[in-house]
């Protein structure tokens, strides 16, 4: 299973639920579906209040139990380590795959943390991070921001990922903006 890691803003905007949580248990495999679930302890929710309604406490995260079908395998054994998890809601359950944005909270830049906590949401409605994977790339719309990290650095951990958000400058126009300048 292969997928291009998304810009964190894309992960935020395309997810139903974005939370901070600790993985606290060994995965359990459902013997009917061959899906596995990890027990988690949620510490913060950044997106999904409306989608979840009253069931605002997520206790498990679900994923295919196999690598070949894009299952997520949690390798850290540190149960006190917090992770940013961006996933989809299916039947009220949080689902993730290999392609989901799951990262140790401590590995995120201060700018990314700020993005997840308050800024990425501003760009969700109007703006699109547009991956540039090979030259030449052209902006297809004024609301697109060209994401060149992977082209220039071969990594999703480039400057645009770690420090910038694609945000509205004026109606019909989005540009890369420093998350530092977004401090309230």
């Amino acid at each position: 299973c292969t997928c291009v890691p998304p810009h964190p803003q894309t992960a935020f905007c395309n997810s139903d639920l974005v939370i901070r949580a600790k993985f606290v248990g060994t995965p359990e495999v459902n013997q009917t579906t061959l899906y596995q679930r990890y027990e988690i302890k949620m510490t913060k929710m950044y997106k999904g209040f409306q989608a979840l309604g009253d069931a605002a406490d997520i206790r498990f995260v679900y994923t295919p139990a196999m690598e070949s079908v894009c299952g997520y395998f949690h390798r850290s054994h540190n149960r006190s380590e917090e992770f940013l998890i961006a996933g989809k809601l299916q039947d009220g359950l949080l689902h993730i795959t290999t392609c989901s944005f799951v990262a140790p909270w401590n590995s995120l830049s201060l700018a990314q943390r700020r993005g997840f906590t308050k800024t990425y949401t501003v760009g969700c409605e109007e703006c699109t991070v547009f991956p540039c994977l090979s030259i030449p790339c052209k902006l297809q719309s004024g609301t697109h921001c060209l994401w060149t990290d992977q082209l220039l650095q071969g990594s999703e951990k480039g400057f645009q990922s770690r420090h910038l958000a694609c945000l509205p400058r004026e109606p019909g126009l989005c540009t890369w903006q420093s998350l530092r300048s977004q401090i309230a």
Epitope: V29, Q31, T32, T33, L34
Partner: antibody, heavy 113, light 111 residues
């Protein structure tokens, strides 16, 4: 109690086909993923294929991918393994197994000219 | 491909205890609590002795016990008896290959 009974084994020529069946009883068949495991003469155990309880998801070992097809009929409590393009190295006793515990007695498949 | 490592053979005298190890990785034995142990006598089907690391199916003697530490699972047989002589296989759920087995351990009961 849990019972799994395999059938359909036999002698087949290289390149031929065979369909194995496994009749299950003593448990709610549709509630369990099932798998096929094989054991070549004098050798260890090798996982072959698995299928989810609904039959919607199937998985195969690299050695049989593209040649074998696992399926199930939950209304008949039966698991199947369709084996095509058989090779000499597929010669083995084939066991039907419930995830992750009970096995049948096995059925012998011999691929030889 | 043998994914889990077991000793090829172990032996013990009647009444003794023996332990068979089964070493895997963090994506199989270490990552899940789904390790099973099977006993196989010549010409017979494997018989489930332990499932989910340490649980015994009804009808299996309490002389058989299972445990796990890190990436290694163990089967211990206490009060060894002549009928325990057989091949023993460990099996684990595996994130990469679905199900993986050990290569098998031949248990010989001496005397």
């Amino acid at each position: 109690q849990v019972q799994l009974v395999e059938s359909g084994g036999g002698l087949v020529q290289p390149g031929g086909s065979l369909r194995l069946s496994c009749a299950a009883s003593g448990f709610t068949f549709s509630s369990y993923a099932m798998s096929w495991v094989r054991q070549a003469p004098g050798k260890g155990l090798e996982w072959v294929s698995a299928i989810s309880g609904s039959g919607g998801s199937t998985y195969y070992a690299d050695s049989v991918k593209g040649r074998f097809t696992i399926s199930r009929d939950n209304s008949k409590n039966t698991l199947y393994l369709q084996m095509n393009s058989l090779r000499a190295e597929d010669t083995a006793v084939y066991y039907c197994a419930r995830f992750f515990d009970y096995w049948g007695q096995g059925t012998l498949v011999t691929v030889s000219s | 491909d043998i994914a889990l490592t077991q000793p090829a053979s172990v032996s013990g005298s009647p009444g003794q205890s023996i332990t068979i190890s089964c070493t895997g990785t963090s994506s199989d034995v270490g990552g899940y609590n789904y390790v099973s142990w099977y006993q196989q006598h010549p010409g017979k089907a494997p018989k489930l002795m332990i499932y989910d690391v340490s649980n015994r199916p009804s009808g299996v003697s309490n002389r058989f016990s299972g445990s796990k530490s890190g990436n290694t699972a163990s089967l211990t047989i206490s009060g060894l008896q002549a009928e325990d002589e057989a091949d023993y296989y460990c099996q684990s759920y595996d994130f990469i290959n679905v199900i993986v087995f050990g290569g098998g351990t031949k248990l010989t009961v001496l005397g």
